[in-house]
């Protein structure tokens, strides 16, 4: 072509895939008349006529560009729509008059790749591999031109390093003309890389400048041999009988070795293997003092058959023995004295307390309780509590019953009970004394007796309310070797118009239940008279 040697460098037009490229013919009026121009595409040094301009009117030539070209800017600019990577070539416009001149445009096409897709080695990497192992792959799809990949470890770019880091990349051309970049990072890893964060970055260019996209960060499973094995006990701190205790083996290797836990036999001093659960944990539930002793863990690497032993660990399950009280069953006359002594053993220092069983009142802080000038009210339960103050919840108790000799003593002397005729009445009578009394009733009915404690008895009587019973009332009599005592129950008919009982009566403790003799299913509440001062 005449004058081609003097051609200046082509004008550069940059455009993204899918958008429209505006190819402006840069011929000056002196170089050619823009109303008479031919447009060519140049591919592999071969020119192909793609568009003609005649008298300012444009006409596409048949071929790959036929549907995508149009004239703009009064014929000076050729618009190419839906740009593809295949359009990256030189376009030239050639003026016909006064003499043949041409203007060249280099079209550069760009497309950002998709987000890089990183996949980590799912099987992991041993630290002792002979050569760099595959750590992760990175795929950047559908970019143009080919993006550049950079691998990072903990935010620092990785460089090729002989026998340590190798990055292998390749690209494939899709049918669209876009490139898919694939890269694999191979590296020799060390134990410290178990927490390392790897990611890949794609660097690419667009008309707007340089850009990059990063993958998500990944960690790689790193396998390294165990160097140390140790025991861990849960819960941490002082252990006590009854606790759930877990003893587990731990190791600093990945994967962990096969564990076994053994306890030293105190008599033979031999280590005896304990039975662990499926997770290799020795569970002591409930822990007992016999579980105390020296434990150790063995870790066996099944690949190398190397065995490692932990430091032994002393386990102490704190305990309080059964509490003993002397005398065990004290009996005393009224007015006499009594000394109660409490004993127990423990793995720790003990504190003792004496409490009154019925009220929970603390009587003494110490192992000895002295009771003087005993009254019959002093009879009943006394509890010794032996506890370890440094270990909350570690305690044992023993109840002792103090018996004060005396005749029966009634819970009440007299009581008024509101009743209806023909109902079955449920009456109760309570007495205490030492020896424990027995209770009899002055009327026929079904009676049953329950021992409440060594000195106290409760008798219940089921009886049908008859006119005779209303007249006589009911008496219960308690007797023992030292005497007898009686309680009286007065029966009063309920008047249906009476909504409230006399103001001097109080609600009783027992109820009387309707029986088949009554016409209605009703319940009668027992009422009792104000209790007298003395109940003896």
């Amino acid at each position: 072509v005449p004058g081609e040697a003097e051609q200046p460098a082509p004008e550069l037009v940059e455009v993204e895939v899918g958008s429209t490229a505006l190819l402006k013919c840069g011929l000056s009026q002196s170089q050619g008349n823009l109303s008479h121009v031919d447009w060519f595409s140049v591919h592999k040094e071969k020119r192909t006529l793609i568009f003609r301009v005649r008298q300012g009117q444009g006409q596409s030539e048949p071929g790959e560009y036929e549907q995508r070209l149009s004239l703009q800017d009064r014929g000076a600019t050729l618009a190419l729509t839906q740009v593809t990577p295949q359009d990256e070539r030189i376009f030239l416009c050639q003026g016909k008059r006064p003499r043949s001149q041409e203007y060249r445009i280099q079209l550069r096409v760009y497309k950002a790749p998709e987000e890089p897709n990183i996949q980590v080695n799912p099987l992991g990497i041993p630290v002792n591999s002979k050569e760099p192992e595959e750590v992760a792959t990175c795929v950047g799809r559908n970019g143009y031109p080919i993006p550049q990949v950079i691998w990072y470890k903990n935010g620092r770019p990785l460089k090729e390093e002989k026998n340590r880091v190798h990055i292998q990349s390749s690209q494939t051309v899709e049918s669209s003309g876009l490139y898919t970049l694939q890269s694999i990072l191979k590296a020799q890893l060390v134990k410290e890389d178990k927490d390392a964060q790897f990611y890949c970055e794609l660097n690419y260019r667009l008309p707007s400048g340089n850009h990059m996209k990063e993958s998500r960060e990944v960690t790689v499973p790193v396998f390294y041999p165990t160097e140390k094995v140790w025991l861990e006990v849960e819960p941490v701190g002082m252990l006590k009988e009854g606790d759930r205790v877990e003893i587990r083996c731990l190791a600093d290797g990945n994967p962990p070795p096969h564990f076994s836990i053994s306890k030293q036999n105190p008599s033979t001093r031999e280590a005896e293997e304990e039975t662990t659960n499926d997770n290799g944990v020795l569970v002591l539930e409930p822990a007992r003092k016999e579980h105390s002793g020296r434990y150790e863990c063995q870790g066996l690497d099944l690949d190398t058959m190397i065995s490692l032993l932990s430091e032994p660990q002393e386990l102490l399950v704190n305990y309080v023995s059964d509490v003993r009280v002397s005398p065990a069953a004290p009996e005393r006359q009224e007015g006499s004295s009594l000394t109660l002594t409490c004993e127990a053993e423990s793995s720790q220092d003990l504190e003792f307390q004496w409490l009154r069983e019925e009220t929970g009142q603390v009587l003494e802080r110490g192992p000895v309780l002295q009771l003087h000038d005993l009254k019959r009210e002093a009879g009943g339960g006394y509890r010794c509590v032996a506890s370890v103050p440094s270990i909350p919840g570690l305690n044992r108790t023993q109840l002792v019953n103090v018996a004060i000799f005396g005749p029966p003593w009634m819970a009440f002397k007299e009581r008024k009970v509101w009743v209806k005729e023909n109902m079955v009445l449920n009456l109760s009578c309570e007495a205490s004394g030492h020896p424990r009394p027995t209770i009899s009733w002055n009327v026929n009915g079904t009676a049953s007796e329950q021992d409440q404690d060594p000195q106290r008895v409760l008798s219940t009587l089921n009886v049908l309310v008859t006119p005779e019973l209303l007249e006589t009332g009911v008496e219960c009599t308690a007797s023992n070797d030292l005497g007898k005592n009686t309680s009286i129950l007065f029966l009063e008919l309920v008047n249906l118009t009476t909504l409230t009982p006399d103001s001097n009566t109080t609600t009783g403790l027992s109820t009387s239940t309707a029986s088949p003799h009554t016409r209605a299913n009703s319940t009668s509440t027992e009422r009792k008279l104000p209790e007298p001062e003395s109940r003896g």
Partner: antibody
Framework: EVQLKESGPGLVQPSQTLSLTCTVS????????VSWVRQPPGKGLEWIAA???????YYNSAFKSRLSISRNTSKSQVLLKMNSLQTEDTAMYFC????????????WGPGTMVTVSS | DIQMTQSPSSLSASVGDRVTINCKAS??????LAWYQQKPGKAPKVLIF???SLQTGIPSRFSGSGSGTDFTLTISSLQPEDFATYYC????????FGQGTKLEIK
């Protein structure tokens, strides 16, 4: 053309050792890892073991104590040994190539049937 | 170990139908998933990798989607040669396969 082919004894006595060979062509064992996958009759697929392009060996923990995988790069062969066979080990055994830039299996051998029976 | 659960276990469809097969992972596997097709007496063949990338040479009627724990294989218009058993496989931590979905002719 990438090809893999498994070969083995077909029938194995219970408690005996199984030896399988996977012979490959069209690629190098130093550029692609190879795995063994098995499929009991009428059942699903189960990954057994792998050897990476660098020669690192991996095993399914369910079989680890009775497996051994190795390779002979000059013969383009991957070998699998499994001892203490039981009737439950009756299956079709496949070897499969790991794609060079991914972790899935892009080429598989046709498989070899192994029956464990006395 | 990561468990892979496929649903349904079997499926009847006709030529031309649009079919979806689901796969659920017991934990997040991002997009570390492949789909395979297996015909009786044959080895499995990879269709989709990285959850949504079509393997070279596989017809475009096959597509994969999903990320994290839930994944889907879609066949947009069933062809006679598509009746087979389909397996999903995770490669995020070790290798595990789904139990398979048998696609049968209705």
């Amino acid at each position: 053309e990438v090809q893999l082919k498994e070969s083995g004894p077909g029938l194995v006595q219970p408690s005996q050792t199984l030896s399988l060979t996977c012979t490959v062509s069209g690629f190098s064992l130093t550029s692609n890892g190879v795995s063994w996958v098995r499929q009991p009759p009428g059942k699903g697929l189960e990954w057994i073991a792998a050897i990476s392009s660098g020669g690192t060996t991996y095993y399914n923990s369910a079989f680890k104590s009775r497996l051994s995988i190795s390779r002979n790069t000059s013969k383009s062969q991957v070998l699998l040994k499994m001892n203490s066979l039981q009737t439950e080990d009756t299956a079709m055994y496949f070897c499969a190539r790991r794609y060079g830039y991914g972790w899935y299996f892009d080429f598989w051998g046709p498989g070899t049937m192994v029956t464990v029976s006395s | 170990d990561i468990q892979m659960t496929q649903s349904p276990s079997s499926l009847s469809a006709s030529v031309g139908d649009r079919v979806t097969i689901n796969c659920k992972a017991s934990q997040n596997i991002y997009n570390s998933l492949a789909w395979y097709q297996q015909k009786p007496g044959k080895a499995p063949k990879v269709l989709i990798f990285n959850a949504n990338s079509l393997q070279t040479g596989i017809p475009s009627r096959f597509s994969g989607s999903g990320s994290g724990t839930d994944f889907t294989l879609t066949i947009s218009s069933l062809q006679p040669e598509d009746f087979a058993t389909y397996y999903c496989q995770q490669f995020y931590s070790g290798y595990t396969f789904g139990q398979g979905t048998k696609l049968e002719i209705k």
